[in-house]
């Protein structure tokens, strides 16, 4: 097991997951972290504890390994980092790779008012509502580098888009957590459409799919839900 | 869906050896990782050693040059040969596996492993 010393002056790995960063609870998913050619070892660490290990064959010479985790539930959700050796020397941690566990216990109902398909400005707010009672509410946005919004709520929660432009428009579905890496299965997508303006004409997403396999996003994690941060949460994490 | 029985365990005297085994039924056994935990009454279950389906290992450092971790793949079987035992050994011991897994994975966390068995004891004493 790796050993916190002085010595840890190699570059920090790259660490990303495939297909997503949000698996459904029961299902697969690889981890991915990429180091250095002459690596020797690399260690997988969840919430601090030591999680898993490889050791690359000396034929393959690649700079990367996979951790497999075979059945995602929420006892593997939750901060993942990585670490390699070459030589002696270990590397820096790799940044926070979050990883959310979906498909549990509940689906949430999520709709729009004043109804899906709005004039460009006019005032928008999504609903979510979820029977069992839960700590917190997000929304994501398919598609895009777009930013998650999250409320606090028992029952439900309001999301106030405030007036509507075209980077509104999209396909939007909603979780409940039980904490911030256990969710609720999907609610049922709602398609916010923008009319008016100087296309005027219906603007849904170019290419839509519901599937979480394909979703980037940002995770804004603020009391209100309301305000954005920078924190970008996306596949690969490397900066 | 694959079953793990554990064997071997029993009462030995300090300095010791025993040779845990575990059967695991179905055809997964070659694809899978294997690993070995125990519990020791009143404390948490520890990881103890663990095998990679290419047959790397990796071992707890309280352990470390007294057990031996190794599989048979043709007889479903994963196997800790246990020496120089120690009365802090004392604990009921459970085999694991990760079922299926990739490439040269070991795995140290018990929240990796998705199949256990039912565990066997072993007891160290004078």
């Known amino acids: 097991q790796r050993i916190n010393t002085e010595k840890e002056t190699l570059p920090k790995p790259i660490i990303w997951a495939k297909p997503s960063i949000m698996v459904t609870n029961g299902n697969s998913v690889n981890i991915w972290c990429q180091g250095a050619q002459s690596a020797s070892e690399y260690q997988l660490y969840f919430e601090g504890s030591f999680f898993a290990l490889e050791r690359p064959k000396p034929s393959r010479s690649m700079n990367k390994v996979r951790f497999f985790i075979s059945q995602m539930t929420s006892h593997t959700a939750g901060i993942y980092t990585c670490f390699y050796q070459s030589g002696e020397l270990w590397s820096k941690s790799s940044n926070p790779l979050k990883l959310v566990v979906t498909g549990l216990y509940d689906t949430p109902n999520l709709w729009v008012y004043p109804r899906p398909e709005v004039t460009l400005g006019e005032n928008v707010t999504f609903f979510c509502q979820l029977k069992t009672a839960t700590s917190k509410f997000f929304l994501l946005k398919e598609r895009g580098s777009n930013h998650i919004q999250n409320k606090y709520g028992n029952i439900q929660a309001e999301f106030p888009m405030g007036p509507v432009t075209r980077a509104h428009r999209g396909t939007y579905r909603c979780f409940g957590s039980y904490n911030d890496y256990a969710w609720s299965f999907p609610s049922e997508p709602v398609t916010l459409l923008i009319t008016g303006g100087v296309e005027n004409s219906s603007l849904a997403p170019t290419d839509p799919t519901s599937s979480l396999d394909y979703w980037e996003f940002d995770l804004s994690t603020n009391e209100s839900g309301l305000q954005k941060d920078s924190a970008f949460w996306d596949h690969t994490t490397q900066n | 869906e694959v079953q793990l029985v554990e064997s071997g365990g029993g009462e030995v005297q300090p300095g010791g050896s025993l040779r845990l085994s575990c059967a695991a039924s179905g055809r997964t056994f070659a694809s899978a990782a294997m690993g070995w935990f125990r519990q020791a009454p009143g404390k948490e279950r520890e990881f103890v050693a663990a095998?990679?389906?290419?047959?790397?290992?990796y071992y707890a450092e309280s352990v470390k040059g007294r057990f031996t971790i190794s599989r048979d793949n043709a007889k479903n079987t994963l196997y800790l040969q246990m020496s120089s035992l120690r009365a802090e050994d004392t604990a009921v011991y459970y085999c694991a596996a990760v079922v299926p897994t990739y490439g040269n994975n070991i795995y140290v966390h018990s929240a990796a492993y998705n199949y256990w068995g039912q565990g066997t004891l072993v007891t160290v004493k004078p």
């Open positions: 095998i990679s389906r290419s047959d790397d290992t």
